[in-house]
Every structure is written in structure tokens, then in C-alpha cells.
């Protein structure tokens, strides 16, 4: 599998409609929780929780502050922590507790605390519960949590130093935690947790499971340096701990290695960054998407692997265990365990078979089973990705978060659309197209290029958004910017499953937001733009320039995958000649204008889509070069003497026949650099005039012209 290509389109922050929320002097907007039924997005930040309108996040509905007392700050600072940054209250847990309350935990100046937030009054109840084991002490430490039936399952560190990792369940009747032992958790960096419900009609009466994803230091591989390993672990919701062995500890904690590698090149992605569990009506078993980077990531590599949950379940239910053996100098080595496995199976959830054997609860499990799972929490079998390869590998980018949406294209094909954020504040939207990856677009969410810390996807039909949280605020973006594709070709070439061309309205529309039937809409995920109706009209601009000047003709082609070239009187221009230059890889510069330069200039783009080449006429300009006699009297029109060598620009209406382009002979260089001739004349542009004072009085007029063209593909 090759590296993913560059995004086809790059949307700058100001180019697209993004809604933003931020409060001055509030930072670290890293906890997001969406209540779809209330159309409310809850935002946990440093020292504050906000409720905003999920359809327009700039509308704040409620706010509550949870600040650290000066006394607590001082005590924290005495322990060597920063009073200005670390000794504050970073909200780290924001989970639904009931229809009217949220469970909120914060680092609270290295004294983690939890409270209940009443959603009616939007005030904390003042419970001030000890947050140890539920929330990290240090805002820099990793954490994850999920609320399951009113009980909080967390993965975090249990002490001030962050040296004691813990996966726990906060429960009034049955609190549980992991053993503090290297085989269980070895310096983990927690990434994600979620509950997977067993289907009610499950024949084996199985339990719900809570999955944890993290990266930890390997125990099974020995190298000179610490090898990091991505893990999937799971516990059973019904676990009540053991009676004697593993008392108040998990009896169902098992973990396995997640594989995400490129077999052909030996590229191994072993640092887990984020996980998204995709649930969809069409999926019998959830699929989870995991985002990785390699341990030694000096080139900025990122990968996404997708896994069937059933693969993980198979490893935990039937896989082999690993065992530690002591070799010389009391050195521990981990190997596959091939001995007898006690019954009931260690780490298994209590199912119908166990109940039939009178093991109705983990408290009834025999010591042999419990001792075995205590000593063998690690599986020998690994969890492998779908198709045994990554869905996406991208170079020169550090991805931070992922969300995935399953959507249906017009032809009925189902696509998993991956929204992946970067450490530079951008969002990539990618799909798999016939074993290749197509990055539809890149959107700059945060203008300061700051890392995206959290991503959230709304699942409500009709109004679909991605929410991204960073240090400075939250941004709301639609799933697609269909309306930004101005032509049928652009709409089709985008190969965006959310977008289709509507011939009646001549607009690119969002499929999920169109109420009208999809009949007549055009969408070709193959990128075959020949399905587009012929353009009967193509507007062009007419410019008048003075002799000896320089003209700049604009060509706005958004596609990063397209190659731009220019034609003059149907002949392809050589941009590297002394006569012509390219500005910004697309705009044409014509130097030292003479009457021979008058005529029709066309900017064409060539884009390879699969094995086809799609040609488009992006812009057409008619240039007329005139010799302007020097005025006898002093000019009185000095106010318009600001257009360099341009005399006038007209946008006119006419009818001309284009011709299909030959194979282009010249293209814009990737650097976009051009060599200007010595002392070039002032430049005139076709769209925005350059401000250059000139001695020749100039008049300005505009008119619109349309072309019938057959060369628009």
C-alpha cells in the first residue's frame, strides 16, 4: 500500500464557514460531550464547563466555573508545580450521569476531584468526591473514561507522580481496579475507552464489555531501548472481583497487542493516538478505527487501521495466553503459554455456560482460574486489522484524533469517511476508493495551527457536524463543503460521497441535507466527469493592456492534484520562456506586451483520476494590447491611475468555439518560482489591480462575455 496522496483540496480557515466558540482566558477545551436530543454540546475546559447550542456553538447557553482556591494553589506550588498552569483545575472527565446531570472530574491542582453538575441549574452539587483513580493528578498525564449504567470506568494514574497506572470502576456496590503490577499495566498512555453492549438475543447470555485502548512499554519484546506496544484490553461489566484472590480487582482483565503495520516495508505503527468505535445499522459487529504513529517518528508518519470487534473478541475468548518465565540473572522473558488452561476460562465473562456450572458471579470463580488470570493478563495472539493492512498511511503529517462516519453514496455504495485531525490544526477527510486512499479535502480549523486535542462527530440526521477542541477553543465544521464546488466537474472530481451535482439548480449539494429525491443528481465516485452536462456558456474576461507592460492572468484552480497549463490561440504556452512566467503556480505572467500578444488565453487543468485524464477550462481571458499615445495636456484622471499596464478590463458576451487541448507541454513547477526578466513593467491583473502609479491616464470599463465551449472537460 502506497502513502496517501496529498489532500485534493485545501480550505484555508477563512475560506469556509466554520463556527467557533471560545471564552477569553479559558484554555484547554479538551472534553466534549454531545447531547443530540437537547442539541447541546457540553465543553469541559480549564476551570470551566460550558453548554453551547450544538447547531451553532458560538451561542453559549450556560457556563459554570470550578476554580482552585488560592490555598490549594499554594500547596500545589510548594510541591514544585507551576501555579500559573499546572496548579489549576483541568476538566478531564465529562460524562452523562442521568438525564439531568453530568459527572465531572478535574485535576484540581494535583488533588483530583469529582462532582455532579445539575443541568437544570447548571451548578455543581458540591459533592467534591475524591477523584483519585478517576482523573489524573497531572494535566499532562493520559486519561480516558466512559460512563456505563451510572458507573464510571477510567484509565488514568493513581498518584501524584503518575507512576501508578490504574483501570478502575467507580461503583458504590462493587468498585474494582487493576493490580498494580507490570504484567497488568506497564507505564501505559491511555487513549480511549468504550462499552460494547452484547445484543439482547445473544445465545450465550454474555455480558457487556468495556474496552480500553492504550500504548504501554512492552514486556514481551526485548531491545536495548523501551519498545512501545499498542494494546486493546477489556473487562466485563458484570465483574465483581474475586472472593479471596483478586478481591476488589478485575477478574476479567485481559489485554492483547494491536497490529498496525505495512508488511511489505516493515513499517510498524506502535504508538496508539486515538480510537473511534463505528456503530452503524448495517454493521452486525462494531468496527473500531485506530490512529497510530511509529515510535521513532522523525518523518511525520501516521496510519489508520480498522478492526472488527469480533477479531478482538476471538483473541480474548479463544486465543493463547502469554507467560513470564525467569531466565538467568532473574531476567524475565515472556513466552507463549502452552499448558493446561483452567475452567472456567480465565478472564472470560460470566455467560450461560458458566452459570450452568454454578459460577453465577466472579465471586464464585475458583482460585485456579483467578490465579491464572492474575498471572496471565496478556494474550499471545494479536488483534489484526481488516485486510491485514492499514486503511491509510500518510507521510509528513502527525494525526491526533479520528472520527468515522458511514455514509451511502448515490449508487448505494457504503463508504467509511475518516475525519482525521492534525497537530497543526487541520482536518483531513479521507475515504478508501478501490484499495487506494483518497483524501477529499483538508480544512484548516484553527488559524494558529495548534494541535487538535479532541474530535467529536454528531450523528443526528440532517444537521451533521464535526466538533474539534484545541487549547484555544472549539470549532464546528460541516461534514462537507459541497457548495464550494462551483462546477459539475469540480463536484464530481471531489469524489465526496456527501456531495452531488444538481443540474436544475446548477449547484453542488449535500446529499444528506437535500429533502428532494436524489433523482437527477450527479455523483460519480470514480471521478468520471464525462457524466457532467456540457456547459453551454463559459464566461471570460477581456482586458486591454498597454504596449510594453506586463499582464497577470488569473486562474483559480483549487485542486492540489491538478496540473495547470495555459493555451494561447490554441497553442500550449511554455511558461519557462522569457516571455511568460507562472505566479503562484497558476497565474500567467506575460512580459513586455506587444500587439502580437493580443488574443484568447485559456487556463486549463489536467487531473489524473484512476486511469483517466480529466481536462477542464478553468479560466478564459481575451487580451488586447494597445499603443497609448502620450497625452498633450496633463491628465485629470489621476484617481484611476492605479492599474499598472492595464488600460481596461471588460467581461464580455460572445460565442466562440473552443478546441480540445493537446497534450500539455508545460506545467507549473511545484515551487511556483519564476524568473522575471530584468526591470519588468508594472503588472496589471485580471481580477485585483496591482496598485502602481502610472503616467498614462487609464479608463476602466467592464462587460460580461459568454463562450460556448466544447473543451470544458
Amino acid at each position: 500500500m502506497a502513502f496517501a496522496p496529498i489532500p485534493r483540496i485545501t480550505w484555508e480557515h477563512r475560506e469556509v464557514h466554520l463556527v467557533q466558540f471560545h471564552e477569553p482566558d479559558i484554555y484547554n477545551y479538551s472534553a466534549l460531550l454531545l447531547s443530540e436530543d437537547k442539541d447541546t454540546l457540553y465543553i469541559g475546559a480549564r476551570e470551566a464547563v460550558f453548554a453551547v447550542n450544538a447547531l451553532n456553538i458560538s451561542e453559549k447557553q450556560h457556563e459554570v466555573y470550578w476554580k482552585v482556591s488560592e490555598d490549594k494553589k499554594a500547596k500545589c506550588a510548594e510541591k514544585g508545580k507551576s501555579k500559573q498552569t499546572e496548579c489549576l483545575n483541568y476538566i478531564r472527565v465529562l460524562q452523562p450521569l442521568s438525564a439531568t446531570s453530568l459527572y465531572v472530574c478535574g485535576t484540581n491542582a494535583f488533588q483530583p476531584a469529582c462532582d455532579h453538575l445539575n443541568l437544570t441549574s447548571f451548578k455543581f452539587l458540591g459533592k467534591n468526591e475524591d477523584g483519585k483513580g478517576r482523573c489524573p493528578f497531572d494535566p499532562a498525564h493520559s486519561y480516558t473514561s466512559v460512563m456505563v449504567d451510572g458507573e464510571l470506568y477510567s484509565g488514568t494514574s493513581y498518584n501524584f507522580l503518575g507512576s501508578e497506572p490504574i483501570i478502575s470502576r467507580n461503583s458504590s456496590h462493587s468498585p474494582l481496579r487493576t493490580e498494580y503490577a507490570i504484567p497488568w499495566l506497564n507505564e501505559p498512555s491511555f487513549v480511549f475507552a468504550d462499552v460494547i453492549r452484547k445484543s439482547p438475543d445473544s445465545p450465550d447470555g454474555e455480558d457487556d464489555r468495556v474496552y480500553f485502548f492504550f500504548t504501554e512499554v512492552s514486556v514481551e519484546y526485548e531491545f536495548v531501548f523501551r519498545v512501545l506496544i499498542p494494546r486493546i484490553a477489556r473487562v466485563c461489566k458484570g465483574d465483581q472481583g474475586g472472593l479471596r484472590t483478586l478481591q476488589k480487582k478485575w477478574t476479567s482483565f485481559l489485554k492483547a497487542r494491536l497490529i498496525c503495520s505495512r508488511p511489505d516495508s516493515g513499517l510498524v505503527f506502535n504508538v496508539l493516538r486515538d480510537v473511534f468505535v463505528l456503530r452503524s445499522p448495517g454493521l452486525k459487529v462494531p468496527v473500531f478505527y485506530a490512529l497510530f504513529t511509529p515510535q521513532l517518528n522523525n518523518v511525520g508518519l501516521s496510519a489508520v487501521c480498522a478492526y472488527n470487534l469480533s477479531t478482538a473478541e476471538e483473541v480474548f475468548s479463544h486465543g493463547k495466553y502469554m507467560q513470564s518465565t525467569t531466565v538467568e540473572q532473574s531476567h524475565t522473558k515472556w513466552v507463549r503459554y502452552n499448558g493446561p488452561v483452567p475452567k472456567p476460562r480465565p478472564g472470560a465473562c460470566i455467560d450461560s455456560e458458566a452459570r450452568a456450572a454454578n459460577y453465577t458471579s466472579s465471586l464464585n470463580l475458583p482460585d485456579k482460574t483467578l490465579q491464572f488470570v492474575k498471572d496471565h493478563p496478556l494474550m499471545d495472539d494479536s488483534v489484526t486489522p481488516i485486510d491485514n493492512r492499514p486503511r491509510l498511511i500518510k507521510k509528513d503529517v502527525n494525526y491526533t484524533q479520528i472520527v468515522v462516519d458511514r455514509t451511502q453514496a448515490l449508487d448505494g455504495t457504503v463508504y467509511d469517511v475518516m475525519f482525521v485531525s492534525t497537530d497543526r490544526g487541520a482536518l483531513h477527510k479521507a475515504i478508501s476508493l478501490e484499495h487506494a486512499v483518497h483524501i477529499i479535502e483538508e480544512t484548516q480549523l484553527f488559524q494558529d495551527f495548534e494541535p487538535v486535542q479532541t474530535l467529536l462527530l454528531s450523528s443526528k440526521k440532517g444537521n451533521r457536524f464535526v466538533y474539534a477542541g484545541s487549547n484555544s477553543g472549539v470549532v464546528q465544521a460541516p461534514l462537507a463543503f459541497c457548495g464550494k464546488h462551483g462546477t459539475c466537474e469540480d463536484c464530481v472530481l471531489a469524489r465526496d460521497p456527501y456531495c452531488a451535482w444538481s443540474p436544475p439548480t446548477a449547484t453542488c449539494v449535500a446529499l444528506h441535507q437535500t429533502e428532494s429525491p436524489s433523482r437527477g443528481l450527479i455523483q460519480e465516485m470514480s471521478g468520471d466527469a464525462s457524466v457532467c452536462p456540457d456547459k453551454s456558456k463559459g464566461s471570460y474576461r477581456q482586458h486591454f493592456f498597454k504596449h510594453g507592460g506586463t499582464a497577470e492572468l488569473k486562474c483559480s484552480q483549487k485542486s492540489n492534484l491538478a496540473r495547470v497549463f495555459w493555451k494561447f490561440q490554441n497553442g500550449v504556452l511554455k511558461a519557462e520562456s522569457p516571455k511568460y512566467g507562472l505566479m503562484g503556480r497558476k497565474n500567467l505572467l506575460i512580459f513586455n506586451l506587444s500587439e502580437g500578444d493580443s488574443g484568447v488565453y485559456q487556463c486549463l487543468s489536467e487531473e489524473r483520476v484512476k486511469n483517466k485524464t480529466v481536462f477542464q477550462v478553468v479560466a478564459k481571458h481575451v487580451l488586447e494590447v494597445k499603443v497609448v499615445p502620450k497625452p498633450v495636456v496633463a491628465p485629470t484622471l489621476s484617481v484611476v491611475q492605479t492599474e499598472g499596464s492595464r488600460i481596461a478590463t471588460k467581461v464580455l458576451v460572445a460565442s466562440t468555439q473552443g478546441s480540445s487541448p493537446p497534450t500539455p507541454a508545460v506545467q507549473a513547477t511545484s515551487s511556483g518560482a519564476i524568473t522575471l526578466p530584468p526591470k519588468p513593467a508594472p503588472t496589471g491583473t485580471s481580477c485585483e489591480p496591482k496598485i502602481v502609479i502610472n503616467t498614462v491616464p487609464q479608463l476602466h470599463s467592464e462587460k460580461t462575455m459568454y463562450l460556448k465551449s466544447s473543451d470544458n472537460r
Partner: antibody, heavy 118, light 106 residues
Framework: EVQLQQSGPELVKPGASVKISCKAS????????MHWVKQSHGNILDWIGY????????TYNQRFKGKATLTVDKSSSTAYMELRSLTSEDSAVYYC???????????WGQGTTLTVSS | QIVLTQSPAIMSASPGEKVTITCSAT?????MHWFQQKPGTSPKLWIY???NLASGVPARFSGSGSGTSYSLTISRMEAEDAATYYC?????????FGGGTKLEIK
């Protein structure tokens, strides 16, 4: 100790512009928003806007858009407010105030008196 | 924008007397903040987030309220408390201040 030192009093003619400075010390200048407040002669306090020194992004009270422009110089930890097209209505004391999470102005400058008179 | 109305505009109190200044908002606000200003000086943050006393503020001061009605209370008036007190909301932009209450000592 946190300090905000504002520039001295200004006497300017109507129609002119003026730039008031606020030099910050004793804290991380780029890490906190800087707010500006106008106190006119009836002692009425009016919030003008804020700027985030980290990226220079500013937000204004609609009433002061076009009147005030907020800028910062990170190298000297100084915030500036330029007021243009001055009229007698702009005569007031102008304060800069360091932001804090959840409230404005845990520290205020000493104020700059602006008098617009012909 | 939210308008804050303070009452009374001017009041005087004897030493040891209990003083209450109220601030009424035209819309619901989450929190109210209070500033103290003495003649010739800049405003000082006095009470933040409705009920938290700023650093150095005597314990005889307290703040309370919710929704559209908030108050600042001095349990026992002292001479040094004579000043103008302003309420401020920042829940809805733009932030707004009350017209001020001038508190004098009898």
C-alpha cells in the same frame, strides 16, 4: 508582582488619533487576554474589547468597532489601543486590565486620561 | 446587550451597620463580579464569580445571587469600605457594568 503601566495623559484635537500603551510585567504576557475599559466622566464603565497577545486576535464591543484598534508587541510585553476620529465624547479615562478565567480584570492599569479638545 | 441596574445609586452607612447593594440584570446571567473603586484610583476586583472574595478582601464582604438578581453585602461597615462598587457580567457578550453604587460613611 503583576503590574500594568499605562502611558501618560493625552490632550488631542478633534478628528485626530491617539495610541495608548500598557506595559505588562510580572506574569506571562502572551498567556492572558488583555481587556480595555473606558470610564467616562459620569463614572460609567464601558468594556471596549480584548486582545489575545499570543496570536494578536482581538474582539470588540460593537459600539467601539471602527473607533478602537487593539494591538500588541510581544517582544516588549506591551498592549496598545489606538482611538481614531476623536470627538469630545471620547474624553475619558481608559484602562487596560489583565484577564483571568471567568472574569475580567484581576489587575488593572492606573488609567490613561484622554482629553479631546480644540 | 445585558443591562445591569444597581441600587441604590448612592447610600451612606454608619460604622458597624450591615450594607447590601443589589444588581439586577435584564437577562439571566451565570455569574456576577464586583469591583471597588476609590477616587483617583483604578477599579479593583473585589468579588468574582458571584461569591468568591478576591485576594486581600476582608471577610466581612460577601456576594450572592443567581439568575437576574445579585447582591454584595458588607456585614459590618467600616470607614475603609467607603467607595464606589460596580457589578459586572461576562456571561453574555459584550461584558457590561452596572452604573455603580457610591457608598459613603456616615
Amino acid at each position: 508582582e503583576v503590574q500594568l503601566q499605562q502611558s501618560g495623559p493625552e490632550l488631542v484635537k478633534p478628528g485626530a488619533s491617539v495610541k495608548i500603551s500598557c506595559k505588562a510585567s510580572g506574569y506571562s504576557f502572551t498567556g492572558y487576554y488583555m481587556h480595555w475599559v473606558k470610564q467616562s466622566h459620569g463614572n460609567i464603565l464601558d468594556w471596549i474589547g480584548y486582545i489575545y497577545p499570543y496570536n494578536g486576535v482581538s474582539t470588540y464591543n460593537q459600539r467601539f468597532k471602527g473607533k478602537a484598534t487593539l494591538t500588541v508587541d510581544k517582544s516588549s510585553s506591551t498592549a496598545y489601543m489606538e482611538l481614531r476620529s476623536l470627538t469630545s465624547e471620547d474624553s475619558a479615562v481608559y484602562y487596560c486590565a489583565k484577564g483571568a478565567s471567568g472574569y475580567d480584570g484581576d489587575y488593572w492599569g492606573q488609567g490613561t486620561t484622554l482629553t479631546v479638545s480644540s | 446587550q445585558i443591562v445591569l441596574t444597581q441600587s441604590p445609586a448612592i447610600m451612606s452607612a454608619s460604622p458597624g451597620e450591615k450594607v447590601t447593594i443589589t444588581c439586577s440584570a435584564t437577562s439571566v446571567v451565570s455569574y456576577m463580579h464586583w469591583f471597588q473603586q476609590k477616587p483617583g484610583t483604578s477599579p479593583k476586583l473585589w468579588i468574582y464569580l458571584t461569591s468568591n472574595l478576591a485576594s486581600g478582601v476582608p471577610a466581612r464582604f460577601s456576594g450572592s445571587g443567581s439568575g437576574t438578581s445579585y447582591s454584595l453585602t458588607i456585614s459590618r461597615m467600616e470607614a475603609e469600605d467607603a467607595a464606589t462598587y460596580y457589578c459586572q457580567q461576562r456571561s453574555s457578550y459584550p461584558p457590561t457594568f452596572g452604573g455603580g453604587t457610591k457608598l459613603e460613611i456616615k
